[in-house]
């Protein structure tokens, strides 16, 4: 059963490391897969010192931890590199994290990524 | 500490009903993808179901459709199996685990003993 | 209906080197398959050992590592230890939240 399902065709494309991967730096990327499997998009990126560095961003191969997701929202407490997927054209555009630890209330810090 | 850990398990009959629990902790259980899996006796494991982090989707083998429901309650951390019109064949330790990003299962629990038999 | 297919046992001798291989009856395994791999002792639950191919779990020794070879996902374990018998099972993800296991591995620690 799926409830609510929104497809994922296009993903905004990023890639730090695109001079040494040979990949245009920006751009929005489309979500080829198997007619049966679902795609996302996701975005990775750093905090350094408090300033954000995105690392990349684009189309994320199906994945049930990404079902249901619309928002791109890293809950992981305090990870070295943060992560997180969604589904939704372009869903991948804003990024924020929102650590979601055992008993303390959440903080919210959202971030519009400016490459 | 990550910990899952599984109960409702027993005896039934053939057709009868029970409906198992997995209860977590030391992580934010809201936040990830759920599976139970089973292994009957001297032989390997089975995947039978899976549910999305807000329960909206869920998944189950061919061989359990129509007859397992899976569930979560994110405010109680809680993952659950019901099992209805149970066969001999349903007859398994089931264990509950969670799945992280690239969708595999990187906790387990201890797993809980169903017995389908007359 | 897809069966993923592993040797139903493997025998090492201590130190030496074993490769699990995991394959199915639908084409070629690949890593969007995200293929990861689980020890088990009887009686005990399941370990996760490798997972997406190739990255180890955390507290895995490095002897265990993950790979494609050819058309199926690959465990290899180097230096083989007493305490790696046990039963080894992969598992692809299929998509659209469906899992399917191998039969597992016997893996036998000789002498």
């Known amino acids: 059963a799926i409830l609510g399902r929104s497809e994922t065709q296009e993903c905004l494309f990023f890639n730090a490391n695109w001079e040494k991967d040979r990949t245009n730096q920006t751009g929005v990327e489309p979500c080829y897969g198997d007619k049966d499997k679902r795609r996302h998009c996701f975005a990775t990126w750093k905090n350094i010192s408090g300033s954000i560095e995105i690392v990349k961003q684009g189309c994320w191969l199906d994945d049930i931890n990404c079902y249901d997701r619309t928002d791109c929202v890293e809950k992981k407490d305090s990870p070295e590199v943060y992560f997180c997927c969604c589904e939704g054209n372009m869903c991948n555009e804003k990024f924020s994290y929102f650590p979601e630890m055992e008993v303390t209330q959440p903080t919210s810090n959202p971030v519009t990524p400016k490459p | 500490e990550v910990q899952l850990l599984e109960s409702g398990g027993g005896l039934v009959q053939p057709g009868g009903s029970l409906r198992l629990s997995c209860a977590a902790s030391g992580f934010t259980f809201r936040n990830d993808a759920m599976s139970w899996v089973r292994q009957a006796p001297g032989k390997g494991l089975e995947w039978v179901s899976g549910?999305?982090?807000?329960?909206?989707?869920?998944f189950y083998t061919d061989s359990v459709k129509g007859r397992f429901t899976v569930s979560r309650d994110n405010s109680r951390n809680t993952l659950y199996l019901q099992m209805n019109s149970l066969r001999a064949e349903d007859t398994a330790v089931y264990y509950c685990a969670k799945v992280y990003y690239t969708s595999f299962f990187d906790y387990w629990g201890q797993g809980t003993l169903v017995t389908v038999s007359s | 209906q897809t069966v993923v297919t592993q040797e139903p046992s493997f025998s090492v001798s201590p130190g030496g080197t074993v490769t699990l291989t995991c394959g199915f009856n639908?084409?070629?395994?690949?890593?969007?398959?995200?293929p990861s791999w689980y020890q088990q002792t009887p009686g005990q639950a399941p370990r996760t050992l490798i997972y997406?191919?190739?990255t180890r779990s955390s507290g895995v020794p490095d002897r265990f590592s993950g790979s494609i070879l050819g058309n199926k996902a690959a465990l290899t374990i180097t230096g083989a230890q007493a305490d790696d018998e046990s039963d080894y099972y992969c598992?692809?993800?299929?998509?659209?939240?469906?899992?399917?296991f191998g039969g597992g591995t016997k893996l036998t620690v000789l002498g």
């Open positions: 598992v692809l993800y299929m998509g659209s939240g469906i899992w399917v």
């Open positions: 549910i999305s982090v807000t329960g909206g989707s869920t």
């Open positions: 639908s084409g070629s395994v690949s890593t969007s398959y995200y």
């Open positions: 997406n191919t190739n």
